[in-house]
């Protein structure tokens, strides 16, 4: 008799999830000499242990602690780039500006980027059919708790000037409900972080508005200022130039030394 399985509202675990995580870990540790000591099988075991056999609506940050410990990594705390609703451009940027780091440039962020996963209570099976949706089902699901945990740690590690890339084409340039707005903003450490500088990426060259005056940016400024961190904001009017430079990182007009 087929066993009854909980049907969740979100997509199921990414196919070949264990193989993908393991392969990403091996690739990352090969590329990053400072992480060569990491045992990828142990990383996978810790990752698996965080959600396998557990109810996918009852995951806690504690469940991920063994994984966090194995993935401990030092990035230059003054070279951190946060982002919200503009992931691809942020990632393209750090691929070119190699001395800056998004969360997904770290081992743990790299392992989980764009993946979905969940298990089932009291079975060692991975659920490839469906996983809880953050809104429709529950917020304490394996994916959401993972990103909340690593995002909090990443923000806590930041120092000096922290940059955040925001999407100026969205109705809410700063969204309090995003990971940046709900987790990272509140975990920047005022004793370490001097300034949060927002880069608001415009939709096109013809858009001459000052999006740093947007009400949601003012809201972000208010939140940051109340935390005794300085705030600054810059309009970035050249997504075309930005992308041109991303595609051609060696381009002389992008890395101009004058």
């Amino acid at each position: 008799v087929p066993r009854w399985r909980q049907q969740w509202s979100g997509p199921g675990t990414t196919k070949r999830f264990p193989e993908t995580v393991l392969a990403r870990c091996v690739k990352y540790t090969e590329i990053h000499p400072e992480m060569r000591h990491v045992d990828c099988q142990s990383v996978w075991d810790a990752f698996k242990g965080a959600f396998i056999s557990k109810h996918p609506c009852n995951i806690t940050e504690e469940d991920y602690q063994p994984l966090m410990k194995l993935g401990t990594q030092t990035v230059p705390c003054n070279k951190i780039l946060l982002w919200s609703r503009i992931k691809d451009l942020a990632h393209q940027f750090t691929q070119v500006q190699r001395d800056m780091f998004t969360l997904e440039d770290t081992l743990l962020g790299y392992l989980a980027d764009d993946l979905t996963w969940c298990g089932e209570f009291n079975t060692s099976k991975i659920n490839y059919q469906s996983c809880p949706d953050w809104r429709k089902d529950c917020s304490n699901n394996p994916v959401s708790v993972f990103w909340k945990t690593v995002s909090r740690r990443f923000a806590e590690a930041a120092c000096d000037v922290v940059h955040v890339m925001l999407n100026g084409s969205r109705s809410k340039i700063f969204d309090k409900n995003s990971t940046f707005g709900s987790v990272e903003v509140h975990n920047l450490q005022p004793e370490k972080v001097q300034t949060l500088e927002a880069w608001v990426i415009h939709g096109g060259r013809e858009d001459s508005r000052d999006l740093c005056q947007d009400p949601t940016i003012k809201e972000l400024e208010s939140i940051i200022s109340k935390r005794n961190i300085q705030f600054s904001c810059k309009n970035i009017y050249r997504p075309d130039k930005f992308l041109q430079c991303v595609k051609n990182p060696e381009d002389s007009s992008c890395t101009s030394e004058i």
């Epitope: 810059k234 009017y237 991303v246 002389s252 992008c254």
Partner: antibody, heavy 120, light 105 residues
Framework: QVQLVESGGGLVQPGGSLRLSCAAS????????MNWVRQAPGKGLEWVSN???????YYADSVKGRFTISRDNSKNTLYLQMNSLRAEDTAVYYC??????????????WGQGTLVTVSS | DIELTQPPSVSVAPGQTARISCSGD??????VSWYQQKPGQAPVLVIY???NRPSGIPERFSGSNSGNTATLTISGTQAEDEADYYC????????FGGGTKLTVL
């Protein structure tokens, strides 16, 4: 070293036309956006026009519809075709290379300029 | 478009610090560059992206930008620094300030 040399300036009557050229050397011309910036006698700098590497063009409102910027990458040359000239177009016209980063742009290299005088 | 306003002139004694302001509505939201122009010569970039100095520009030149004012600071001003200075920003189009004549007394 980077060199920009403008030519084609001179005296022209109101309503007349003139074509300015800027010969570039010392860098890969096709890799850079280029600009024209002008300066009326005794006045400040005013951006006129921009052409991107891919050929997209941009103009100041004061010259839109009258001036046309173009480039010939095979000749390493930038052009500014100026039609329906007015007295207020009298200025030294500079050719300037657009440099920058992902975040912002600026004019790192300038030519010595060519004087355009519009007068009857 | 943003309008950039500069004082027409600034005077400074040799060896003293000169500060040239460039004001505009929330200019801190835009990156600012500064150019030096001597009589009969083309402009020369002295500061870009608010506070970065091109190679070959003396360390006495520095820039800052926040709120409604960007500032070019020349510490230990020398006679050769006497020139016109222009601020410039970009908001989909390039905008220059009206220029400031720096006189070294």
């Amino acid at each position: 070293q980077v060199q920009l040399v403008e030519s084609g300036g001179g005296l022209v009557q109101p309503g007349g036309s003139l074509r300015l050229s800027c010969a570039a050397s010392g860098f890969t011309f096709s890799s850079y956006a280029m600009n024209w910036v002008r300066q009326a006698p005794g006045k400040g700098l005013e951006w006129v026009s921009n052409i991107q590497r891919v050929g997209s063009t941009y103009y100041a409102d004061s010259v839109k519809g009258r001036f046309t910027i173009s480039r010939d990458n095979s000749k390493n040359t930038l052009y500014l075709q100026m039609n329906s000239l007015r007295a207020e177009d009298t200025a030294v016209y500079y050719c300037a290379r657009e440099d920058g980063s992902y975040m912002t742009d600026y004019f790192a290299y300038w030519g010595q300029g060519t004087l355009v005088t519009v007068s009857s | 478009d943003i309008e950039l306003t500069q004082p027409p002139s600034v005077s400074v004694a040799p060896g003293q610090t000169a500060r040239i302001s460039c004001s505009g509505d929330n200019i801190g939201h835009y990156y600012v560059s500064w150019y030096q122009q001597k009589p009969g010569q083309a402009p020369v970039l002295v500061i870009y992206s608010d506070s970065n100095r091109p190679s070959g520009i003396p360390e006495r030149f520095s820039g800052s930008n926040s709120g409604n004012t960007a500032t070019l600071t020349i510490s230990g001003t020398q006679a050769e620094d006497e020139a016109d200075y222009y601020c410039q920003s970009y908001n989909g189009t390039y905008v220059f300030g009206g220029g400031t004549k720096l006189t070294v007394l």
